[in-house]
């Protein structure tokens, strides 16, 4: 409405404060200076503006910063961050972990939105790698964050960052992701003693090769069945009955309940029935006595 484009007398905003909360949309547009808003962004969240009013404030910032907001403004966006589109965020250059934390806090309790995903992507790309502090922050807000990365993206995670990873952060990781993370974890925890090492490495073992599982079986680690069931099938198959018994310790009895599920099922099929019987668990399906087992894969490798 043409007559409403000028700010009414006495309504020009000198500060961003609660005197503005009942301004109509056009009054905010006409009476709030964008530069003033930018310098006082930290006040916006303390003022109960309606969502329409927030839209107006965003529009003002967009006009002031068509190439993207400076970090001094981004850090104080608060609820206004929820109004940003991924396209808006791609224009930003966020370098401070404090800024990242402030924006993640706004979205806390919600699933990772496209805005948050874009923000994290911009931040990590800007840093060049997922350092420990960043990973610590991201997994604190989004426990599944690590498992949302591709194996290629995970390759940029330095071993030192692995210390920030909690078991629950790996819950949704698939074997390809664990294949990348396991060697990093092995490197990160290499100076720990046996029992402490196992506690730390346990969550990553879904990426462990056969030789490492064999080594663990010599250390009385007592791996639980939940961890065993997440191991790579190809890594479990070459293990002997004696090695699995040592690896699981008292938990070996749990094999019976899992005998129809991979990798236990496939492992049983590779073992001599005689050897399985030594466990006294009633596991069936092993290779009958007197049968010769030819490892064709080994034969092919030699020829």
């Amino acid at each position: 409405e043409v007559e409403k484009t000028a700010c009414p007398s006495g309504k020009k905003a000198r500060e961003i404060d609660e005197s503005l909360i009942f301004y109509k949309k056009w009054e905010l547009e006409a009476c709030v200076d964008a530069a003033l808003l930018a310098t006082q962004m930290d006040r916006v969240n303390a003022i109960p503006f309606t969502y329409e009013q927030l839209d107006v404030l965003k529009h003002k910032l967009d006009e002031l910063y068509p190439q993207g907001y400076p970090e001094s403004v981004i850090q104080h966006l608060g609820y206004l961050f929820l109004k940003m589109s991924p396209e808006d965020i791609r224009k930003w250059n966020v370098t401070s972990l404090e800024t990242l934390k402030a924006l993640l806090e706004v979205n806390k309790g919600h699933e990772m939105s496209p805005q948050v995903a874009t923000l994290i992507d911009r931040f990590v790309k800007g840093r060049g790698q997922l350092d420990k502090d960043t990973l610590d922050t991201l997994t604190a807000f989004y426990p599944g964050y690590l498992c949302s990365l591709s194996p290629e993206e995970l390759s940029s995670v330095p071993p030192s960052s692995i210390w920030a990873v909690r078991p629950q952060d790996l819950d949704t990781c698939d074997p390809r992701q664990l294949d990348v993370l396991y060697p990093k974890a092995r490197l990160a925890f290499q100076n720990m003693n046996g029992s402490e090492y196992f506690v730390k490495i346990q969550s990553f073992l879904g990426g462990a090769p056969t030789e490492d599982l064999k080594a663990l079986s010599q250390q009385n680690v007592s791996m639980d069945l939940a961890t065993f069931m997440k191991l790579r099938t190809d890594a479990v198959l070459p293990l002997t009955v004696a090695e699995v018994q040592k690896l699981l310790g008292p938990h070996v009895e749990g094999l019976k309940a899992e005998e129809r599920h991979r990798p236990v099922r496939d492992w049983i099929l590779r073992q001599r029935q005689d050897d399985l019987d030594t466990l006294g668990l009633g596991l069936q399906g092993g290779i009958p006595n007197g049968y010769l087992v030819l490892d064709l894969s080994m034969q092919e490798a030699l020829s």
């Epitope: 609660e18 309606t50 329409e52």
Partner: antibody, heavy 122, light 107 residues
């Protein structure tokens, strides 16, 4: 306990005045924007007036602008509505209501007074 | 100002029925719509905020959905205490506005 206790309604002649009060307890009164919502007999709800937590900013519906004044005394945890130049169409039950959040940007009411009837009639 | 229109203005239903009330805004209000229940002689009571979030203490038979301009309040299995008038309210912009109400009566 958390509550809003209203007083001050009654019968008044057209052109007359009345002051409604709303005493709050059980929450930090000064942190919350407060409103008056009215309901004419057999009709729906109308947001009449609102005031910010500090009292520094006020809102009035066009239907009452210039005649009603909202105010608050945070030291007494009390909200007021001064109604002047009353008309027959102002006859309604008036409710005071608390905005749900101290911060944030949601505007809905999670706590209401019981209401007080204002009748404007000669 | 944003106008909020409720339908129907009244409905008759029986205990156990599934009841649906709709609310339409004159422009898009995202998910900033709230629902209240009012019984005769009483103040309104908040049921649903932000279109679909159930207010603490409200029975789970009440649910809300919608975004943009069209919203719905559903009572999955009507109980005797649910016979009342229901109002929607938009909180996207000033002035806050209410629907005209839907009276749910006993069939």
């Amino acid at each position: 306990q958390v509550q809003l206790v209203q007083s001050g309604g009654g019968l008044v002649q057209p052109g007359g005045s009345l002051r409604l009060s709303c005493a709050a307890s059980g929450f930090t009164f000064s942190s919350y924007a407060m409103s008056w919502v009215r309901q004419a007999p057999g009709k729906g709800l109308e947001w009449v007036s609102a005031i910010s937590g500090s009292g520094g900013s006020t809102y009035y519906a066009d239907s009452v602008k210039g005649r009603f004044t909202i105010s608050r005394d945070n030291s007494k945890n009390t909200l007021y509505l001064q109604m002047n130049s009353l008309r027959a169409e102002d006859t309604a039950v008036y409710y005071c209501a608390k905005r749900e959040a101290a911060a944030g940007h949601d505007w809905y009411f999670d706590l209401w007074g019981r209401g007080t009837l204002v009748t404007v009639s000669s | 100002d944003i106008r909020v229109t409720q339908s129907p203005s009244s409905l008759s239903a029986s205990v156990g029925d599934r009841v649906t009330i709709t609310c339409r805004a004159s422009q898009s209000i995202s998910s900033y719509l709230n629902w209240y229940q009012q019984k005769p002689g009483k103040a309104p009571k908040l049921l649903i905020y932000a279109a679909s979030s159930l207010q603490s203490g409200v029975p789970s038979r009440f649910s809300g959905s919608g975004s943009g301009t069209d919203f719905t309040l559903t009572i999955s299995s009507l109980q005797p205490e649910d016979f009342a008038t229901y109002y929607c309210q938009q909180s996207y912009s000033i002035p806050l506005t209410f629907g005209q109400g839907t009276k749910v009566e006993i069939k």
